[in-house]
């Protein structure tokens, strides 16, 4: 059966409205299709940064071979949305689709790709292109994970104790310290799916004068350092 593998190609470009745009389409590596009518479904997990534009692609099948192209969109807490194009009548139809930022890239008879303009947290979900041919269906599915960059702050709150916070990230950031101290980490979950991570560390050893908080996140990593003073130091703030 048609079984493309899951190696990926990620393209990034700048659109003229200055939003970063990423397109996740199949890498051109795939196991040859035999003549079975059971055409395998391929699913990809795809992390995409919030506020960028995203383009999702269908399998590489020429329009002349198609009967119907359907995008099925399943977002949390919403009814399934479908966008369909029927070649014979050259008509498009939408069912339960309310988000105007999710559209065909252009006319579906010219380009079957789906685009999400200015990705938001609410776009977390499952997107599937279904290409109906006379001999069976080809599928390409995406589990879209929207990434939110946390705001990172580092401050000293009392003698030889520092607090590093990664606020409202998605998914949760990971905080580590150099050098290691006596640390406690808490996570606070918000209703929009973001997480604030707070790590509080204390250093008894007096020869430790500078400490570094390292925040690891899928959107990028950030390091901040602070000098341990007998009095609280100035607050530092940064975006990843």
């Amino acid at each position: 059966a048609a079984q493309p593998n899951n190696s990926l190609m990620l393209q990034t470009s700048k659109e003229n409205h200055a939003l970063a745009s990423s397109s996740l389409c199949m890498d051109e590596k795939q196991i040859t299709q035999n003549y079975s009518k059971v055409l395998a479904e391929v699913n990809t997990s795809w992390p995409v940064k919030m506020a960028t534009n995203a383009v999702l692609c269908c399998p590489p099948i020429a329009l002349r071979n198609l009967i119907i192209i359907t995008w099925e969109i399943i977002l949390r807490g919403q009814p399934s949305c479908t966008k369909a194009y029927k070649k014979e009548t050259n008509e498009t139809k939408e069912t339960n689709c309310t988000d105007e930022r999710i559209t065909w890239v252009s006319r579906p008879d010219q380009n079957s790709d789906l685009q999400i303009r200015t990705v938001a947290i609410t776009h977390d979900g499952y997107y599937r292109c279904i290409m109906v041919t006379p001999d069976g269906n080809f599928h390409r599915g995406y589990h879209l994970q929207v990434l939110v960059t946390p705001e990172v702050t580092l401050f000293q709150n009392r003698n030889r104790t520092a607090v590093c916070k990664a606020v409202a990230g998605k998914p949760a950031a990971h905080i580590s310290w150099i050098p290691e101290g006596d640390c406690a980490t808490k996570q606070e979950y918000w209703s929009n799916g973001t997480v604030t991570v707070k790590s509080t560390c204390h250093w008894e050893v007096h020869n430790v004068s500078t400490v570094t908080c390292h925040v690891s996140h899928l959107t990028g990593n950030k390091s901040l350092y602070i000098e341990l003073l007998p009095v609280p130091g100035a607050k530092k703030s940064a975006k990843l």
């Epitope: 996740l24 389409c25 199949m26 692609c57 020429a62 329009l63 002349r64 380009n111 079957s112 001999d135």
Partner: antibody, heavy 119, light 110 residues
């Protein structure tokens, strides 16, 4: 297995027409687009057009429009390519080829039919 | 229409060596992350045989000595190492809506 068998060689006079057949077996005939390609002696491959047996759609190379007609007979799983107003430069081997869905690649070809145009 | 230009027109290679054929398209044949470029081998008296599809995918049953690469407008077919029975004509092809072939490259084994 998937197989395309073409009709035998033809000799035609200039101005005549020729109709080459391509019989398909081993798959659902109406499900796959069929292309026609020709190759003059010692020359390269030249795409002529295609027919989609599912809906009878055709698309021809501009060079052959008005002279070529592609048809299909679903009862015999056969596609036909008819070329009219033949001239000596139409002397060539004519191939049918089936297009596979994934990537629009042509994985199966007929054995070829030699058409000779000579007075 | 997209025009495909192959080079070189002919190529003589010793067994065990590498043969490289290039194909340049007059405009991009890549869309939605896929390059609709295929490579065929044709031996005298035979129909063409598919070697590579979508620029870099090896067709089932084709030896791994054959490989394809490229995207956009520039594509390459590589045979490494070349064997005696690789003597043939090789064609690049763009196949998506309107279909075109390169003019062919004749590969001879010394």
């Amino acid at each position: 297995q998937v197989q395309l068998v073409q009709s035998g060689a033809e000799v035609k006079k200039p101005g005549a027409s020729v109709k080459v057949s391509c019989k398909a077996s081993g798959y659902t005939f109406t499900s796959y687009v069929m292309h026609w390609v020709r190759q003059a002696p010692g020359q390269g491959l030249e795409w002529m057009g295609y027919i989609n047996p599912y809906n009878d759609d055709t698309n021809y190379n501009e060079k052959f429009k008005g002279r070529v007609t592609m048809t299909r007979d679903t009862s015999t799983s056969t596609v036909y390519m008819e070329l009219s107003s033949l001239r000596s430069e139409d002397t060539a081997v004519y191939y049918c080829a089936r297009e596979d869905y994934y990537g629009s690649r042509w994985g199966t070809w007929g054995q070829g039919t030699l058409v000779t145009v000579s007075s | 229409d997209i025009v495909l230009t192959q080079s070189p027109a002919s190529l003589a290679v010793s067994p065990g060596q590498r043969a490289t054929i290039t194909c340049r398209a007059s405009k991009s044949v890549s869309t939605s992350g896929y390059s609709y470029m295929h490579w065929y081998q044709q031996k005298p008296g035979q129909p063409p045989k598919l070697l590579i599809y979508l620029a870099s995918n090896l067709e089932s049953g084709v030896p791994a000595r054959f490989s394809g690469s490229g995207s956009g407008t520039d594509f390459t077919l590589t045979i490494n190492p070349v064997e005696a029975n690789d003597t043939a004509n090789y064609y690049c092809q763009h196949s998506h809506e309107l279909d075109t072939f390169g003019q062919g490259t004749k590969v001879e084994i010394k």
